[in-house]
Amino acid sequence: TFRDCAEIFKSGLTTSGIYTLTFPNSTEEVKAYCDMDMGGGGWTVIQHREDGSVDFQRTWKEYKEGFGSPLGEYWLGNEFVSQLTSGHRYVLKIQLKDWEGSEAHSLYEHFYLSGEESNYRIHLTGLTGTAGKISSISQPGSDFSTKDSDNDKCICKCSQMLTGGWWFDACGPSNLNGQYYPQKQNTNKFNGIKWYYWKGSGYSLKATTMMIRPADF
């Protein structure tokens, strides 16, 4: 059994694709996409957007357990990611594509999610990369919010206003789980797929991938 894609890579399975991972300290399993090509491989993909084929305006339970297809658009699941990152130091890489053919990334040298009792609060340190010098995930980290669980710092309900589950602040500079807008409809969309410190307020991105890997890989 494998805890993450880094373990799979180190076992000699170095082809990108869908693999079965096992929750730490349990027999519960989850299917994930492993990127074995990007930057040395061993990346466990925890989120992917590319075409709007999957609805990301989901409930707390769905974000907790995961949804979508690892071959396409999906969310791996907050509970698995929380358990995985609480017992080991992980880096988070966020890969972004715009509609003009440009790509950028943000790399956080330490990433973990608190447990459900703390609303899967995100913790990040050590930002580098090309998608902005300032973190587009508010610091210090926010609690996770969904349409049926409002944990943000806004009088409004950010998840309702901007759609999707995310670590909203009030409402903050990013939402990679926002409404997917096709090309030519992707500007001036404040509920789109946003990464402010790369593309600004109203720009909705073409594709996003969030992936994690042990810091000592």
Epitope: I155, C156, Y196, S201, G202
Partner: antibody, heavy 121, light 107 residues
Framework: QVQLVQSGAEVKKPGASVKVSCKAS????????MVWVRQAPGQGLEWMGY????????GYNQKFEGRVTMTTDTSTSTAYMELRSLRSDDTAVYYC??????????????WGQGTLVTVSS | DIQMTQSPSSVSASVGDRVTITCKAS??????VAWYQQKPGKAPKLLIY???TRDTGVPSRFSGSGSGTDFTLTISSLQPEDFATYYC?????????FGGGTKVEIK
């Protein structure tokens, strides 16, 4: 205190252009989006667009697309709105206003005093 | 664009009266509604945002309510300085739009 001071009244001929300025003071200029709203005589308010002084990003009301350009000069904390190919129905008071948030164009908490632009032959 | 239909377009009232202004959105705008007061020759002034939150320094006689498509601004006891025009504004969807205004006049 937080203040937006706009340039003075203008009289323009049809087909001409006008550039209105809005100087901000009392806050960090790049921390908030700026919007432009106009009001024709005796009429309601009409949102024209916004500019993000932090990165120069803009978003325009489709009604004005191609005729309006919004810019900023962060060294002087000034926003500008240029409207081209003026028509008589562009006669209005033009307001700049600050949004309460950098990341979204929410509500407008501070307004300039307005600039009357009259378009007449 | 989302249409914001304000009513009434004008209302005559006396000092001390309770005045209610309504705004109806053409589609769901959650609670993304603000209210502004405008006096002749002056710029609008923010009163209420997120449908019911008073801006700093706004007297407690002003209150807002509503969600979805129906919103209300209430002035509980009209004061002489409240005679003005009031506008609702939705910022849920691009482009932001305003109601046509309600003029509160002295009876």
């Amino acid at each position: 205190q937080v203040q937006l001071v706009q340039s003075g009244a203008e009289v323009k001929k049809p087909g001409a252009s006008v550039k209105v300025s809005c100087k901000a003071s009392g806050y960090s200029f790049t921390d908030y989006n700026m919007v432009w709203v106009r009001q024709a005589p005796g009429q309601g308010l009409e949102w024209m667009g916004y500019i993000d002084p932090y990165n120069g990003g803009t978003g325009y009301n489709q009604k004005f697309e191609g005729r309006v350009t919004m810019t900023t000069d962060t060294s002087t904390s000034t926003a500008y709105m240029e409207l081209r190919s003026l028509r008589s129905d562009d006669t209005a008071v033009y307001y700049c206003a600050r949004t309460r948030d950098r990341y979204d164009v929410w509500y407008f908490d501070v307004w300039g005093q307005g600039t009357l632009v009259t378009v007449s032959s | 664009d989302i249409q914001m239909t304000q009513s009434p377009s004008s209302v005559s009232a006396s000092v001390g009266d309770r005045v209610t202004i309504t705004c109806k959105a053409s589609q769901d705008v959650y609670i993304a509604v603000a209210w502004y007061q405008q006096k002749p020759g002056k710029a609008p002034k923010l009163l209420i945002y997120w449908a019911s939150t008073r801006d700093t320094g706004v007297p407690s006689r002003f209150s807002g309510s509503g969600s979805g498509t129906d919103f209300t601004l209430t002035i509980s006891s009209l004061q002489p300085e409240d005679f003005a025009t009031y506008y609702c504004h939705q910022y849920s969807s691009y482009p932001p739009t305003f109601g046509g205004g309600t003029k509160v006049e002295i009876k």
